[in-house]
Amino acid sequence: GITNINCSGHIWVEPATIFKMGMNISIYCQAAIKNCQPRKLHFYKNGIKERFQITRINKTTARLWYKNFLEPHASMYCTAECPKHFQETLICGKDISSGYPPDIPDEVTCVIYEYSGNMTCTWNAGKLTYIDTKYVVHVKSLETEEEQQYLTSSYINISTDSLQGGKKYLVWVQAANALGMEESKQLQIHLDDIVIPSAAVISRAETINATVPKTIIYWDSQTTIEKVSCEMRYKATTNQTWNVKEFDTNFTYVQQSEFYLEPNIKYVFQVRCQETGKRYWQPWSSLFFHKTPETVPQVTSKAFQHDTWNSGLTVASISTGHLTSDNRGDIG
């Protein structure tokens, strides 16, 4: 981009240096070079000389016209051909930007991940603006009317210690850039309604060789929330559709969930929880794979294991993967 250059003249853009993408724009260059009546004025975009749509306005000024300008950023500079000068003389340069005004932020969501000490607010920013867009998150107590504002370029983490106006708040988001400003609808929250329990994790699986073989999935969470509802979904890795089991859970001990599965098939499991009756779910846990044996018992440990199988009676393989899938719509 154009940084520090000594100008011998002036370059400007109409309608503005930052403009709406797809507009027709004019770039003007006016020379003010001592002892130089420019024979010709040249325009460069990103270092490449422009050859068309240049109009000489008067002895010192020229105009470059662009129709339907679609580049998000460009560095422009202009030069003059001066008599008795072998090289072109730099007049001035300017960085120009095109983009869009922000959309109205929607789907404003605030959650408190248990133990985080923060309220995390996110929103759908809408279409890409291409230009610097800032967001101001407003948090206003419904009782004290104390309003706090947080400037960010994406989501925001707000310390719950700073929320001193009780438990009931309005939250809304203002989006602003050089081309416009929009404001979201107001979200009314109660701090206790937006807590998401500490992540539930599947630790191991075992298949017990009974008359009808049964697979036990062991899973746990460090949550202190008493009433927690969870869902475990599972499917054969070759399948598209998930089966879902629901549980009312008390995490004072490790959970054991029983499944009657087909033999010699690789399954994938995920779990997620929410405080019973509340709005927001955890994202689905990491993928946990378990292959049911043909006949012999099988134990699998840790989430997202390697595909390591041997001929022994018990197989355990460990990997530290954090792959999650299909998290869309889990919060909201």
Epitope: S141, L142, E143, T144, E145, E146, Q164, G165, G166, K167, K168, H190, D192, D193, G277
Partner: antibody, heavy 119, light 107 residues
Framework: EVQLQQSGGGLVKPGGSLKLSCAAS????????MSWVRQTPEKRLEWVAG????????YYPDNVKGRFTISRDNARNTLYLQMSSLRSEDTAMYYC????????????WGQGTTLTVSS | DIQMTQSPKFLLVSAGDRVTITCKAS??????VAWYQQKPGQSPRLLIY???NRYTGVPDRFTGSGYGTDFTFTISTVQAEDLAVYFC?????????FGAGTKLEMK
Amino acid sequence: EVQLQQSGGGLVKPGGSLKLSCAASGFTFSSYAMSWVRQTPEKRLEWVAGISSGGSYIYYPDNVKGRFTISRDNARNTLYLQMSSLRSEDTAMYYCARKKSDYGAMDYWGQGTTLTVSS
Amino acid sequence: DIQMTQSPKFLLVSAGDRVTITCKASQSVSNDVAWYQQKPGQSPRLLIYYASNRYTGVPDRFTGSGYGTDFTFTISTVQAEDLAVYFCQQDYSSLPTFGAGTKLEMK
């Protein structure tokens, strides 16, 4: 010392109107949400109106909505309850109370003022 | 509206007794419950906020507990000056509601 001094109670005929006042002192009135709570002759407590610190957010239960209006004058440190279309069931002792938002509770109460609705 | 069902309505006690009053909310109110004491001819006085927090100056014989829908208020050792009516109140919704009250009387 926090004080809530109430005035304005009395005897009113059914369908009549009355305005209660609550003068606050000893704290920054404009920083606190306020409420009106009444106590029926049977000694039940009923919350009848609430207002946020700046007066932007106002709440009423259904049984008084459209008949009662809570307001405040932060310059005068005073809370008001304008009551109209009064009914016999509005007969009660009315209290103003300060809401301590970070406690989710009413921590200071006025001395109460009596409204009797009777023909 | 959220209903707060308080029980019992009356309690006959002797000095030194342990007293427990319960309040059940018609839906979860988190821990947004307060307990008040009202003596004859006086305004209500805040004792407990956020279900279990003792208000400034309240003796430690008064305790509260609970979360969600079930709440308990306890006086560990009743004294003569504790004879009063006790009310629970939820502040979870924007429309607060009170329990019907429990009257403590001496045997």
